[in-house]
Amino acid sequence: LTCLGGFASPGPVPPSTALRELIEELVNITQNQKAPLCNGSMVWSINLTAGMYCAALESLINVSGCSAIEKTQRMLSGFCPHKVSAGQFSSLHVRDTKIEVAQFVKDLLLHLKKLFREGQFN
């Protein structure tokens, strides 16, 4: 039974692991960026730090047809407790303020690295 334990289905991914994987994905995007990310698409900026994962997803989910950020969108959905669909507008967004997807991803990476260092995995 001890040996067979290794074949058991894995439990949920620890939050620290999920955050680290999201950071690694964002690093990949920023480092491998050659042409303008998502053809220079613009997304809503964010003006607060609370509820950030859902707000980030609400911004990025409005970018369609950009394979480079599809994995990021999926990963962010794992951090957001509610269903997010295109067109949603959170109070966390700066209304009438849009920034380039590339800058959004770069800033998201900065913020998540800070959270990781501070041990804030959720």
Partner: nanobody, 118 residues
Framework: GVQLLESGGGLVQPGGSLRLSCAAS????????MGWVRQAPGKGLEWVSA????????YYADSVKGRFTISRDNSKNTLYLQMNSLRAEDTAVYYC???????????WGQGTLVTVSS
């Protein structure tokens, strides 16, 4: 792209006050530590003050401690520097800048001139 636009500089008498503002755009201001740096005529850059992204922690150079107050409004994407009890030695161009250790996150404004003179 990223823009930092300072305003509020000008001529003020010794002992007077000024409030500098820095309007940020093109990046997620709320997630950045920010600061003010100044350059007096013919001198090098001098760090003045910094504030953490959430606004809880503030830092000051000894030369301005007790006289200057840094603050931010993340809902308005704006950084402030309230300068009281101004002295002639505070005369400088004041720059708003991001204050991040990470390479590639270094953004600066064009600066605003503060002249303290009678």
């Amino acid at each position: 792209g990223v823009q930092l636009l300072e305003s509020g500089g000008g001529l003020v008498q010794p002992g007077g006050s000024l409030r500098l503002s820095c309007a940020a755009s093109g990046f997620i201001f709320a997630w950045y530590d920010m600061g003010w740096v100044r350059q007096a005529p013919g001198k090098g850059l001098e760090w003045v003050s910094a504030i953490a992204a959430k606004g809880m922690e503030t830092y000051y150079a000894d030369s301005v401690k007790g006289r200057f107050t840094i603050s931010r409004d993340n809902s308005k994407n704006t950084l402030y520097l309230q300068m009281n009890s101004l002295r002639a030695e505070d005369t400088a161009v004041y720059y708003c800048a991001t204050a991040e250790d990470e390479p590639g996150y270094d953004y600066w404004g064009q600066g605003t001139l503060v002249t303290v003179s009678s």
